[in-house]
């Protein structure tokens, strides 16, 4: 079980996550399992492409937000982390790594500067950043 210290370094307040519940998993060792998703927060800073490669090397992808209900623990995430959302300049849409389009009412997109990659921030915010800027990142693996 993850220590409270570890969780407090990731979240804005103490988060109760039933890490050992039988319905959740399997996940890679030391990953957080929550509502049939595995999450890992990596605190080394990489650009978006390196972050994507790191997740892929662990048989995962960068964070995909698909449900505020199933992913409610993300409400409390501290700081900014790369997620798997990129801007498609040709049609102006936002697309996940798997090619699916961002559904409305999942994220609030905030463009701070010109960029095509998105950082996840608490309460379902996506801050747009230059893809070559180093940042921490979140990997995710679906268990079902």
């Amino acid at each position: 079980i993850w220590s409270a210290v570890f969780l407090n370094s990731l979240f804005n307040q103490e988060v109760q996550i039933p890490l050992t519940e039988s319905y959740c998993g399997p996940c890679p060792k030391n990953w957080i399992c929550y509502k049939n998703n595995c999450y890992q927060f990596f605190d080394e800073s990489k650009n978006w492409y390196e972050s994507q490669a790191s997740c892929m090397s662990q048989n995962a992808s960068l964070l995909k937000v698909y449900s505020k209900e199933d992913q409610d623990l993300l409400k409390l995430v501290k700081s900014y982390h790369w997620m798997g959302l990129v801007h498609i300049p040709t049609n102006g849409s936002w697309q996940w790594e798997d090619g699916s389009i961002l559904s409305p009412n999942l994220l609030t997109i905030i463009e701070m500067q010109k960029g095509d990659c998105a950082l996840y921030a608490s309460s379902f915010k996506g801050y747009i950043e230059n893809c070559s800027t180093p940042n921490t990142y979140i990997c995710m693996q679906r268990t079902v």
Partner: antibody, heavy 122, light 107 residues
Framework: QVQLVQSGAEVKKPGASVKVSCKAS????????MHWVRQAPGQGLEWMGE????????NYAQKFQGRVTMTRDTSTSTVYMELSSLRSEDTAVYYC???????????????WGQGTTVTVSS | YIQMTQSPSSLSASVGDRVTITCRSS??????LNWYQQKPGKAPKLLIY???RLHSGVPSRFSGSGSGTDFTFTISSLQPEDIATYYC?????????FGGGTKVEIK
């Protein structure tokens, strides 16, 4: 109906701080960002920043970075804007305004407070 | 940051006239352009959001069009109560920025 009610006029000395409040009603407070916009006498509108009342995330205009602090109290559905190190150029009417969200972007302001006049004078 | 250039800065027209104000952004802002009306001593009011959508309760004589960097605001038939200053504002990128305003007067 949506209402934003701001605190009363303030007179401050240079170097002091001012804290303006904006009490929201008629909608779910934590579902909408709140902006702060100011208007100096005879001048246009100037965006100062915005706050997401569902948490403590803020975005400030670079011009005000380090001098402005936006906070909120969810128990009273009130947002606050504090501006420090006041100078005469900060004399203005300060408005809070609720953000419009289209499912992707918060891009405009649909309801505005009545404004709070802040006068900075020695 | 994105600069919003509004023109003209002031205009005078007769009741019933068609009035047009333009707003140009220094970068592509898609359709994230809003128009506000401000009467002297009052708070601004949203008239049009997302380039062309009329805010609730706003008369249909107000309209907006454009995309990318060039936008237009139109009052199809100017009324005495339309005397005000009108502002455009972009909401695509931080910081949110306003045009300098257009003061509309009756001849």
């Amino acid at each position: 109906q949506v209402q934003l009610v701001q605190s009363g006029a303030e007179v401050k000395k240079p170097g002091a701080s001012v804290k303006v409040s904006c009490k929201a009603s008629g909608y779910t407070f934590t579902n909408y960002w709140m902006h702060w916009v100011r208007q100096a006498p005879g001048q246009g509108l100037e965006w100062m920043g915005e706050i997401d009342p569902s948490d403590i995330y803020t975005n400030y205009a670079q011009k005000f970075q380090g001098r402005v602090t936006m906070t909120r109290d969810t128990s009273t559905s009130t947002v606050y804007m504090e501006l420090s190190s006041l100078r005469s150029e900060d004399t203005a009417v300060y408005y809070c305004a609720r953000g419009i969200y289209d499912g992707y972007y918060v891009y405009g302001m649909d309801y505005w407070g009545q404004g709070t006049t802040v006068t900075v004078s020695s | 940051y994105i600069q919003m250039t509004q023109s003209p800065s002031s205009l005078s027209a007769s009741v019933g006239d068609r009035v047009t104000i333009t707003c140009r952004s220094s970068q592509d802002i898609s359709n994230y352009l809003n128009w506000y009306q401000q009467k002297p001593g009052k708070a601004p009011k949203l008239l049009i959001y997302y380039t062309s959508r009329l805010h609730s309760g706003v008369p249909s004589r107000f309209s907006g069009s454009g995309s990318g960097t060039d936008f237009t605001f139109t009052i199809s038939s100017l009324q005495p109560e339309d005397i005000a200053t009108y502002y455009c504002q972009q909401g695509k990128t931080l910081p949110r920025t306003f045009g300098g305003g257009t003061k509309v007067e009756i001849k």
